[in-house]
């Protein structure tokens, strides 16, 4: 008795965070024995899509010509060989930005901060939201969530950083979201450049990259410390 079929690999191009209306292609790569590929979306009542393999049969393409909220979510793929269906791939989380109007990101007391001091990044939305995300460009784990407790919605979230070091310097954006789908995000805020002075400067970072590209491993995730966020918002690492 042969063991279970190896799981396929699932990925999205140009990335897994896609602006509303943009196209995205989901790829599932299995083996040369694959006869059919299936894409399942979490909590969907039926397979999301099924495709015949592309020659030489070791992968399939699932095209989304225009990203909408229908497509946002968590996916897995499978392939069928003559002996049955494979194990599921690791999940792919497809996130859509542009679902809500952009929040405003500011730094208190100032985006110019001295090393060793404190700064708070403030993300404010026009309408009440229950999740706020702060993204530092080029961070390995770019998403830090502040999520409202008990579903209470807020107009803002604070991301305190203390003490500030040179690692905190860089370009930030924030997003807001509703709790019923963490795969639907607002438009990104305008970028905020946090400049840390009074410390030895390392090499300048490379040009900023879109949030839809894969983050490089060189930066540590943003870790604000200090006071607990206000307004009943709870910090979550995702």
């Amino acid at each position: 008795q042969a063991g279970p079929l190896p799981k396929p690999t699932l990925w999205a191009e140009p990335g897994s965070v896609i602006s509303w209306g943009n196209s995205v292609t989901i790829w599932c790569q299995g083996t040369l024995e694959a006869r059919e590929y299936r894409l399942d979306k979490e909590e969907s009542p039926a397979p999301w899509d099924r495709q015949n393999p592309l020659e030489p049969k070791n992968k399939a393409r699932f095209s989304i010509p225009s990203m909408t909220e229908d497509y946002a979510g968590r996916y897995r793929c499978y392939y069928r060989s003559p002996v049955g269906w494979s194990q599921p791939s690791d999940p792919l989380e497809l996130v859509m930005t542009g679902a809500y109007s952009k929040p405003t990101l500011s730094a208190l007391p100032s985006p110019l901060v001295t090393s060793g001091k404190s700064v708070t990044l403030l993300c404010q939305s026009r309408s009440p939201m229950d999740t706020f995300l702060l993204i530092k460009e080029r961070a390995a784990h770019p998403l830090l969530h502040l999520r409202s407790e008990h579903g209470a919605q807020q107009h803002q979230a604070e991301f305190p950083m203390s003490p500030v070091t040179s690692v905190h310097g860089g370009t930030y954006r924030c997003f807001s979201s509703h709790g019923f789908s963490h795969y639907l995000l607002s438009h990104p805020s305008d970028p905020l450049e946090l400049i840390v002075s009074g410390s030895l400067e390392g090499p300048r970072p490379s040009p900023t990259r879109s949030v839809s590209t894969a983050a490089g491993p060189e930066d540590q995730p943003l870790m604000p410390t200090g006071s607990v966020p206000h307004s009943g918002l709870r910090r979550h690492w995702e």
């Epitope: 009542p45 999301w48 229908d70 269906w85 019923f180």
Partner: antibody, heavy 122, light 110 residues
Framework: QVQLVESGGGVVQPGRSLRLSCATS????????MHWVRQAPGKGLEWVAL????????YYADSVKGRFTISRDNSKNTLYLQLNSLRAEDTAVYFC???????????????WGQGTLVTVSS | DAVVTQESALTTSPGETVTLTCRSS?????????ANWVQEKPDHLFTGLIG???NRVPGVPARFSGSLIGDRAALTITGAQTEDEAIYFC?????????FGGGTKLTVLG
């Protein structure tokens, strides 16, 4: 054209069992998910169960979970519903309905059978 | 358990536009509920109309359209015809099961 024909209904005592069938034609049965839906006399619709195209996933309404089993035989183009431990409140017309090939191809509940009546009575 | 609520009855006239709605007890209807609309005519004749909120079943007249309006799913008949007199059921998906609404009896006064 697409046809769904249910059979197997009848009068049965509480606690007994019954097996319903839904014979299909006019489409590639093995590519589609399938549903059972019921309608009690003078009432609205109640979804009962869903099975995926290959039988790999089944879903049930809480009211029938553990008592009813949905299955299919793709070689015979036939859908089944095994009804065990029947209760008076299971009395209804039972319909099979076609689901989709996939969420991006087709619309659930697009075609329905004419139904088969199950009466649970002592 | 989730409860799906529809208007019990609506009346319209030929040529008028009428909107039927479908509300979920769990909150706003979202794309993840994959709202479906089914028509019942006398003698247990059921026909699917709309799936996935807005996708029309092939062959269903273009006067039938589906959408989300506020926190509800909606079925709009633009230019109702006498043959549209029927009971309309919506169905919503909740992660692992479907739930039908109680149905809306639509009368088209001819």
């Amino acid at each position: 054209q697409v046809q769904l024909v249910e059979s197997g209904g009848g009068v049965v005592q509480p606690g007994r069992s019954l097996r319903l069938s839904c014979a299909t034609s006019g489409f590639t049965f093995s590519s589609y998910g399938m549903h059972w839906v019921r309608q009690a006399p003078g009432k609205g619709l109640e979804w009962v169960a869903l099975i995926w195209f290959d039988g790999g996933n089944q879903y049930y309404a809480d009211s029938v979970k553990g008592r009813f089993t949905i299955s299919r035989d793709n070689s015979k183009n036939t859908l089944y519903l095994q009804l065990n431990s029947l209760r008076a409140e299971d009395t209804a017309v039972y319909f099979c309905a076609r689901d989709v090939i996939s969420m991006v191809r087709g619309v659930p509940f697009d075609y329905w059978g004419q139904g088969t009546l199950v009466t649970v009575s002592s | 358990d989730a409860v799906v609520t529809q208007e019990s009855a609506l009346t319209t006239s030929p040529g008028e536009t009428v909107t039927l709605t479908c509300r979920s007890s769990t909150g706003a209807v979202t794309t993840g509920n994959y709202a479906n609309w089914v028509q019942e005519k006398p003698d247990h004749l059921f026909t699917g109309l709309i799936g996935g909120i807005k996708n029309r079943v092939p062959g269903v007249p273009a006067r039938f359209s589906g959408s989300l309006i506020g926190d509800r799913a909606a079925l709009t008949i633009t230019g109702a015809q006498t043959e549209d007199e029927a009971i309309y059921f919506c169905a919503l998906w909740y992660s692992n099961h479907w739930v039908f609404g109680g149905g809306t009896k639509l009368t088209v006064l001819g």
